[in-house]
């Protein structure tokens, strides 16, 4: 799914109202610590391609990131405010209802999470190049390129 | 408990450089961006730039483009934050701040360093 | 760039009353809208991000609202421990801007 026509602050206040908080009642009890972020984004549209594979596709030691409260909320959002993003999702939620239904937190979980956190932090606020008028607004973002 | 420990106040000459450092702990440094943010006596808050440690990505202020060089030193968890051609107008107190959990704000800002730029 | 502007630039208050504080931006500027406190001597200390979100540890009687251009910062009973200077700032476009701050004192 091409993430470019999405409502991006729409996105951003559902992060901030609700899912933000679900993130960190998942987190609780972890060490800020403890795991350094090695996923990264460099514009809105692939934060949010980074974002829906790291909260939908289940990985070795963390299967069942998709059935957590802020994983639902993140795919409603993401259906409310990207055109056409529903339709793209149906055989993900077939294999979705296949994944193991108990909800297990592993370390590794933990580690995704954080992983997520600092994803979300990049497409709340992408650090740009600058480039004329040097923004990081929703439009523009197709434009810039990450900054070296 | 996350902490952000700045270096002793500078008294500089005009036209020299100055380097504060913003040593950082209690979180994992390279995951939040460090902002710089600069305190005119008795003026307001002016943003200089800001840096993600993680890879040293960087956005500056116009303002301060090409006087100021922002890098970080993830071995020790230390920013640093170089102004050169100093001015009697960057006399001022230099913060540093971190980004917080949401990429919305500035949650933890360093003690300040006095930089006094006088011939 | 975006030019915050706050308003008063400084304003005086009973203890217990409601002090407010508008801060206008040149542009709009969505919901990307922090508020901090700064005491004399001290670090600034961040209040309210995006609008109207309490930062963790921050009193009920500090709030937020607007979006756009206007937007209004609220303590509604003031107390002795909140003298101090108030910044808003935008986070929506590169440069971030801060308003000039507004003294608030205690009448």
């Known amino acids: 799914y091409d993430f470019t026509n999405c409502d991006f602050e729409k996105i951003k206040a559902a992060y901030l109202s609700t899912i933000s908080k679900d993130l960190i009642t998942y987190m609780s009890g972890t060490k800020s610590t403890e795991f350094n972020n090695t996923v990264s984004c460099s514009n809105r549209p692939h934060c949010l391609t980074e974002i829906q594979s790291l909260t939908f596709n289940p990985t070795a030691g963390c299967a069942s990131l998709a059935k957590e409260m802020f994983a639902m909320k993140t795919k409603a959002a993401l259906a409310i405010w990207c055109p056409g993003y529903s339709e793209t999702q149906i055989n993900a939620t077939q294999a979705m209802k296949k994944a193991r239904k108990s909800k297990v937190t592993t370390n590794k979980c933990l580690e995704q999470v954080s992983q997520l956190q600092g994803l979300w932090r990049r497409f709340n606020r992408p650090l740009l190049k600058q480039q004329g008028s040097s923004d990081y607004k929703d439009d523009d973002d197709k434009h810039h390129h990450h900054h070296h | 408990e996350v902490q952000l420990v700045q270096s002793g106040a500078e008294v500089k000459k005009p036209g020299s450089s100055v380097k504060v450092s913003c040593k950082a702990s209690?979180?994992?440094?390279?995951?939040?961006?460090i902002e710089w943010v600069r305190q005119a006596p008795g003026q307001g808050l002016e943003w200089i730039g800001v840096?993600?440690?993680?890879?040293?990505?960087?956005n500056y202020n116009e303002n301060f483009k090409g006087r100021a060089t922002l890098t970080a030193d993830k071995s020790t968890s230390t920013a640093y934050m170089e102004l050169s051609s100093l001015r009697s107008e960057d006399t001022a107190v230099y913060y540093c701040?971190?980004?917080?959990?949401?990429?919305?704000?500035?949650?933890?800002w360093g003690q300040g360093t006095t930089v006094t730029v006088s011939s | 760039d975006i030019v915050m502007t706050q308003s008063p630039d400084s304003l005086a208050v009973s203890l217990g009353e409601r002090a407010t504080i508008n801060c206008k931006a040149s542009?709009?500027?969505?919901?990307?809208v922090t508020w901090y406190q700064q005491k004399p001597g001290q670090s600034p200390k961040l209040l309210i991000y995006?609008?109207?979100n309490h930062y963790t540890g921050v009193p009920d009687r500090f709030s937020g609202s607007g979006s756009g251009t206007d937007f209004t910062f609220t303590i509604s009973s003031l107390q002795a421990e909140d003298v101090a200077v108030y910044y808003c700032?935008?986070?929506?476009?590169?440069?971030?801007?801060f308003g000039q701050g507004t003294k608030l004192e205690i009448k």
């Open positions: 701040a971190r980004e917080d959990n949401t990429g919305t704000a500035f949650d933890y």
């Open positions: 209690g979180y994992a440094f390279s995951n939040y961006l």
């Open positions: 840096i993600d440690p993680g890879n040293g990505d960087t």
């Open positions: 542009q709009s500027v969505s919901s990307d």
């Open positions: 995006y609008v109207s």
């Open positions: 700032q935008q986070h929506h476009r590169f440069p971030l801007t």
